[in-house]
């Protein structure tokens, strides 16, 4: 066949849903990889055309469109599964063409299995909520487009394997699920069930999503360093190591970046001729803040390091912070047989 | 390591009610769900009831309904389940048991037992 | 509500054989069952879980297998401490229930 524009396998797009559950899969042609929505290219007489290779198979082959009661479909831009079997799982492609352009793209396709508490192999989107900071609410997400807007769903919320039924804090509100005061307790997994009604039939939409309850916007601070601090001085001979570690509380902040840096004498590390090794950690505590630590280290420290000036400095959307460190050169201890006995007056 | 200590033998008189405690150590109280299982002497296991502490959630068998009551006291770290209008064929070995998170439904942890015995 | 059925009531085997116990659920329950070991005047011990995962601590000689409605426990060589009562438990649905246990026992 003549050329086509072949995006390859997206791998980006793990498409993961559940077995005997219904599924619709837009094209990602339209979405990540053309400049062009789908009714462009069919009023420009563009066909999207379906195919699919099985797990473990290699032979690529049509997708079967006359099982009974349509149980695949394609409509528009988008393969619908109604339900999914757990043999759809597969790469599936979808090729735009004509008589003279064609492009297509694959992805995978996962057919997952869940058990009674809704454990599985499904990646789970994590939805954070500030501690005690008021009603929050949670939505069942990706529902859109399966049913109409005339269709009124049952939606039943459940935490793990418990229905969310007369909880004190928690509360139901269709496909809103509202935390009145969220606490580390609320931590785990919540999943919405959407049932709804099609041509005669019963369908099931299972979501499950990661509650992670983290530091709250009211308690934010800008980044505080507890070390090096004014009560540690660091004092080294030449020729020994210096370690200075630089440690920084953040807060829990949405979407910031949290940035720690040496500077010795005002410039970067790397833009001066000592040999500096700087070893970083980061720990969190359960609400998310964060602890980063910077050890600076000079394997043999000279003289003239120690006169320099050690600054470890801080940054968050909540500002920023700097602390020098104390570093001075040890005077030797003197030694006795002749400073010693000098100043006692002996010769 | 997790324990779940539960509270000492009864005998009661048919009309009367219990009230049975568990104890629970290591793990934060308030982040599980705490069951209760009883076997009656010979008999096999049957689930009751259990409640989630953090959320003061309760949940109960239907045979159960109306007659059992779960309760927890996160201060003490100490669930309760209080059978009422007891008949002598309650008599039975009462367990509480936890899964190891919400997200389970089997018992990773079970406290030792409380013999109930209704006699008049 | 799910009624679990395990047979046989009682298994006579000798040590080092093999046993093998069945559990039956009146509809699926895919394989969302655990499998518990009780020996006189004790608390149940998890087994499996899952129809087929060890717990921790679990010797391998313990196994299960199945799903839907028919599982599988099987003790590949049986030790002196196996010799008890054991328990199937579905919690596929409300209420989780449990079947009446198989005594394994001496032959």
């Known amino acids: 066949s003549e050329r086509c524009d072949d995006w390859g396998l997206d791998t980006m797009r793990q498409i993961q849903v559940f077995e005997d559950e219904p599924a619709r899969i837009k094209c990602p042609l339209f979405e990540h990889f053309l400049k062009f929505n789908y009714s462009t290219a069919h009023s420009a007489g563009l066909t999207l055309i379906w195919y699919w290779t099985r797990q473990d198979r290699d032979l690529e082959e049509p997708i079967n469109f006359r099982l009974p009661e349509n149980r695949i479909s394609k409509e528009k831009d988008v393969l619908w599964f109604r339900p999914t079997l757990l043999n759809d799982t597969g790469n599936y492609t979808c090729m735009l063409r004509n008589t003279t352009y064609c492009s297509k793209v694959a992805f995978p396709l996962e057919v997952v299995q869940k058990d009674s508490c809704f454990n599985s192999p499904m990646k789970l989107p994590v939805h954070k909520l500030y501690i005690e900071y008021g009603i929050q609410r949670i939505t069942c997400p990706n529902v859109d487009g399966y049913f109409p807007s005339s269709v009124k769903p049952t939606i039943t919320w459940y935490m793990g394997c418990y229905k969310i039924q007369n909880f004190n804090n928690v509360i139901p509100e269709g496909m809103n699920l509202s935390f009145l005061i969220a606490l580390i307790s609320n931590n785990g997994n919540y999943t919405c069930v959407v049932t709804y009604p099609e041509n005669g039939r019963t369908f099931h939409l299972t979501r499950t999503l990661t509650v992670k309850v983290v530091g709250s916007p009211k308690n934010a601070v800008p980044p505080v360093i507890h070390s090096p601090n004014d009560h540690v001085v660091y004092e080294k001979e030449p020729g020994e190591e210096l370690l200075i570690p630089c440690t920084v509380y953040f807060s829990f902040l949405m979407d910031s970046r949290n940035e720690v840096w040496w500077t010795i004498d005002g410039k970067k590390p790397d833009d001066i001729t000592i040999d500096v090794t700087i070893n970083e950690s980061i720990s969190h505590s359960r609400t998310e803040d964060e602890t980063r630590t910077q050890i600076l280290s000079i394997k043999k420290v000279t003289s003239e390091d120690l006169k320099r000036s050690y600054v470890c400095h801080a940054r968050s959307a909540k500002g920023e912070v700097a602390k020098a460190a104390k570093v001075k050169q040890k005077v030797p201890a003197p030694r006795y047989t002749v400073e010693l006995a000098c100043g006692f007056g002996a010769t | 390591q997790v324990q779940l200590v539960q509270s000492g033998a009864e005998v009661k008189k048919p009309g009367s009610s219990v009230k049975v405690s568990c104890k629970a150590s290591?793990?934060?109280?308030?982040?599980?769900?705490f069951h209760w299982v009883r076997q009656a002497p010979g008999q096999g296991l049957e689930w009751m009831g259990g409640?989630?502490?953090?959320?003061?959630?309760?949940f109960y068998a239907q045979k159960f309904q109306g007659r059992v009551t779960i309760t927890a006291d996160e201060s003490t770290s100490t669930a309760y389940m209080e059978l009422s209008s007891l008949r002598s064929e309650d008599t039975a070995v009462y367990y509480c048991?936890?899964?190891?998170?919400?997200?389970?439904?089997?018992?990773?942890?079970w406290g030792q037992g409380t013999l109930v015995t209704v006699s008049s | 509500e799910i009624v679990m059925t395990q047979s046989p009531a009682t298994l006579s085997v000798s040590p080092g054989e093999r046993a093998t116990l069945s559990c039956r659920a009146s509809?699926?329950?895919?394989?969302?069952l655990a499998w518990y070991q009780q020996k006189p005047g004790q608390a149940p011990r998890l087994l499996i879980y899952?129809?087929?995962t060890r717990a921790t601590g679990i010797p391998a000689r313990f196994s299960g297998s199945g799903s839907g409605t028919e599982f599988t426990l099987t003790i590949s060589s049986l030790q002196s401490e196996d010799f008890a009562v054991y328990y199937c438990?579905?919690?596929?649905?409300?209420?989780?229930?449990f079947g009446q246990g198989t005594k394994v026992e001496i032959k």
């Open positions: 048991a936890r899964p190891v998170s919400y997200s389970s439904g089997w018992y990773d942890y």
């Open positions: 290591g793990g934060v109280f308030s982040y599980y769900a």
């Open positions: 409640i989630i502490p953090g959320y003061g959630a309760t």
């Open positions: 509809q699926s329950v895919s394989s969302n």
């Open positions: 899952g129809a087929s």
């Open positions: 438990q579905q919690y596929n649905n409300w209420p989780w229930t």
